[in-house]
């Protein structure tokens, strides 16, 4: 349940099924408000935020980016197409995630519940999408050395990857939120 | 120039069925989930049904579940809706209507088709 | 089933603001029930104003604004004009179908 329904919400003979469009819609609305507060930290924190130097370390990443062939914007959407590239996104996001744990100070729940909700969504989404099979894991082996990979990182760099996944997921909810209003 | 045309409404007895037709042109119609929005004499709007943008989900109104199927053909660019056993209470004036992407774009309501269910 | 309510009637004086609100029988109206409002006159198709809380659609005046107020969607008209008289209906995405209230109809004085 995204923490942004309050109790009496819960209770409202309203209350929709997991795969609902408003929960699934609720739920990316949290994860992007938790998003928020961390970028406020990473942004008060060090000044990556206005950094031109993003390309160095974007080098050194591969995230998950909507593109035309994905079938998530306007022109050219493919429904199918679109919600398999956002599961898979969402499973290849989550090894960045795991990377922002122990990276926030005053914001480390907040972290973790930007990482649990993000499992939940993509529970959410596997209900939704329960007659799709083209959908692939994560391998874990690669995924534990990209972290290591990550982890060993000089610290300018570090602050930077954070900074990148921060916005670069953000980036990627807002456009699956967007599609997701057209399945 | 965006448009949708509603069509196949008239004069029948309860009971009957009838299918009615919206062709849109103007914009990508397999890019939008569209919708059925009815509104009896005198009355408020009241939504009926939407379809998936390639059809995959459908979605009722309790007061319809059952009764109604909702369709699209991408390829023709037409919505249908297929009422069976109809009722007085669903006389009214039938729009159909595409759910827009951003709030900038222009959303267009054709004139509607009127349904009459009448002994 | 949840009901979606708006006040029957409001009037506003030529030039003055009104505020329609838009709220659920049970539990408060977020941001992920996508408020929209439309404009109907007599004899006339709806209009729709605003898309997703406080997006205007493409056309609409900037005298009309939507926002989240409390636990309800609101309209508000800045400096009615009397062409604003009609009826206003606002929908709301429940769960995966959307629910229409039952309309205010505004009154434009003088």
């Known amino acids: 349940v995204p923490p942004g329904e309050d109790s009496k919400d819960v209770a409202a003979p309203h209350r929709q099924p997991l795969t609902s469009s408003e929960r699934i819609d609720k739920q990316i609305r949290y994860i992007l408000d938790g998003i928020s507060a961390l970028r406020k930290e990473t942004c008060n924190k060090s000044n990556m935020c206005e950094s031109s130097k993003e390309a160095l370390a974007e080098n050194n990443l591969n995230l998950p980016k909507m593109a035309e062939k994905d079938g998530c914007f306007q022109s050219g959407f493919n429904e199918e197409t679109c919600l398999v590239k956002i599961i898979t996104g969402l499973l290849e996001f989550e090894v960045y995630l795991e990377y922002l744990q122990n990276r926030f100070e005053s914001s480390e729940e907040q972290a973790r519940a930007v990482q649990m909700s993000t499992k939940v969504l993509i529970q959410f989404l596997q209900k939704k999408a329960k007659n799709l099979d083209a959908i692939t894991t994560p391998d874990p082996t690669t995924n534990a050395s990209l972290l290591t990979k990550l982890q060993a990182q000089n610290q300018w760099l570090q602050d930077m990857t954070t900074h990148l996944i921060l916005r670069s997921f953000k980036e990627f909810l807002q456009s699956s939120l967007r599609a997701l209003r057209q399945m | 120039q965006l448009q949708v045309v509603e069509s196949g409404g008239g004069l029948v007895q309860p009971g009957s069925s009838l299918r009615l037709s919206c062709g849109a042109s103007g914009f990508t119609f397999s890019s939008h989930r569209m919708y059925w929005v009815r509104q009896p004499p005198g009355k408020g709007l009241e939504w009926v049904s939407a379809i998936s943008s390639s059809g995959v989900s459908t979605y009722y109104a309790d007061s319809v579940k059952g009764r109604f199927t909702i369709s699209r053909d991408n390829a023709k660019n037409t919505v249908y809706l297929q009422m069976n056993s109809l009722k007085p209470e669903d006389t009214a004036l039938y729009y159909c209507?595409?759910?827009?992407?951003?709030?900038?774009?222009?959303?267009?309501w054709g004139q509607g088709t009127q349904v009459t269910v009448s002994s | 089933q949840t009901v979606v309510t708006q006040e029957p009637s409001l009037s506003v004086s030529p030039g003055g603001t009104v505020t329609l609100t838009c709220g659920l029988s049970s539990g408060s109206v977020t941001a992920s029930n996508y408020p929209g409002w439309f404009q109907q006159t007599p004899g006339q198709a709806p209009r729709a104003l605003i898309y997703s809380t406080n997006d205007r659609h493409s056309g609409v005046p900037s005298r009309f604004s939507g926002s989240i107020s409390g636990n309800k969607a609101a309209l508000t008209i800045t400096g009615a004009q009397p062409e604003d008289e009609a009826d206003y209906y606002c929908a709301l995405d429940i769960g995966d179908i959307t629910e229409f209230g039952g309309g205010t109809h505004l009154t434009v004085l003088g």
């Open positions: 209507k595409r759910r827009t992407w951003y709030g900038g774009e222009y959303d267009y």
